[in-house]
Amino acid sequence: TTPEPCELDDEDFRCVCNFSEPQPDWSEAFQCVSAVEVEIHAGGLNLEPFLKRVDADADPRQYADTVKALRVRRLTVGAAQVPAQLLVGALRVLAYSRLKELTLEDLKITGTMPPLPLEATGLALSSLRLRNVSWATGRSWLAELQQWLKPGLKVLSIAQAHSPAFSCEQVRAFPALTSLDLSDNPGLGERGLMAALCPHKFPAIQNLALRNTGMETPTGVCAALAAAGVQPHSLDLSHNSLRATVNPSAPRCMWSSALNSLNLSFAGLEQVPKGLPAKLRVLDLSCNRLNRAPQPDELPEVDNLTLDGNPFLVPGTALPHEGSMNSGVVPAC
């Protein structure tokens, strides 16, 4: 017998569905209506046929009582080709739910999203995470999606984006957004970061994650943040191949005084980069290629400095390379 596609845990808390059949029995997902965390993976299926079965233009208020009874707070939908009209229909219905965190992974959104009807209610999400989601509408996708959300979004994560730059003139401000994660967009680069950080649209950012985004120098990132008026408290630049030296012709950049935590781990650094903020609470330089202990004048004034996993800490250690095994003194880097 084939395994059931969905599994609900004993506490009715987490429900995971993996639909891999060409014509899945979607009614199997019904058991997930009791769950708080729901994951639905559609095996790369095209959900276009669903449009024939559902009236995407129906008034979602007719489902309001049922949807209000759902316990789901965290929903992940993955691996499907989804017509924009169907996505919108789902967002309209979920607006009556208690859903707080939505994750979309490995999706291809086809067609354009219609504008929000005047009487429609936006979805009150606190967290939206997108990974490898492509949109037929190109750069305007964030503005189109944003109109279906209430303005209280606190966390936005966009990874493996096909178009990480946004159509800034169409995007409205995210007044409550405190965490923006653009990690795992290796083609972004510093110029792309300038295009993605729409000026004055992210006024409340406290945490900015830019892991594996093709950043080149802390100074270049500083310039992009300054241009956008973004003043994070915490900045993660780990897993970028950073240059320690600054282009002499580049103007010096003044970091925001709000920045108190900077992660430069796994950045391939052989020396402490120039142009760091003058004062930090936390600086993480672990798992780099520092061959000697940084001199006090090379470092910012810092309360909490992490240097684990650098060659200078273990006498006789060569530069770490991928796949190398370090002794027990050095963490696996």
């Epitope: 609900l8 004993d10 009715d12 058991q31 316990r71």
Partner: nanobody, 115 residues
Framework: QVQLQESGGGLVQAGGSLRLSCAAS????????MGWYRQAPGKEREMVAQ???????NYGDSVKGRFTISRGNARNTVYLQMNNLKPEDTAVYYC?????????WGQGTQVTVSS
């Protein structure tokens, strides 16, 4: 191990009604989603009706408006009230308890609708 026992099937005239019952026994520690499914000779098993632990219901397209699923007062008892029965409702009706690891199915009860 969980056992499911269906009852209430039988022979009925078209337009008539039947009420199926399903009782679950064994190691059940929480109220679980349950459902009714049916299989007619030579056809795939199809979902008839489902009910969640919180009482949310879902019906197959062919039975909407005619069949009603409900839960009993006991932890895992489920009923299927079938009205305005049609010959195409003839099938073996199975009860299902959604359960972690491997779902439990009953042995089935025969429903025959004559024209």
């Amino acid at each position: 191990q969980v056992q499911l026992q269906e009852s209430g099937g039988g022979l009925v005239q078209a337009g008539g009604s039947l009420r199926l019952s399903c009782a679950a026994s064994g190691r059940i520690f929480s109220i679980r989603p349950m459902g009714w499914y049916r299989q007619a000779p030579g056809k795939e098993r199809e979902m008839v009706a489902q009910i969640s632990s919180s009482g949310i219901t879902n019906y197959g397209d062919s039975v909407k408006g005619r069949f009603t699923i409900s839960r009993g007062n006991a932890r895992n008892t489920v009923y299927l009230q079938m009205n305005n029965l049609k010959p195409e409702d003839t099938a073996v009706y199975y009860c299902r308890l959604f359960k972690t690891g491997a779902d439990s199915w009953g042995q089935g009860t025969q429903v025959t609708v004559s024209s």
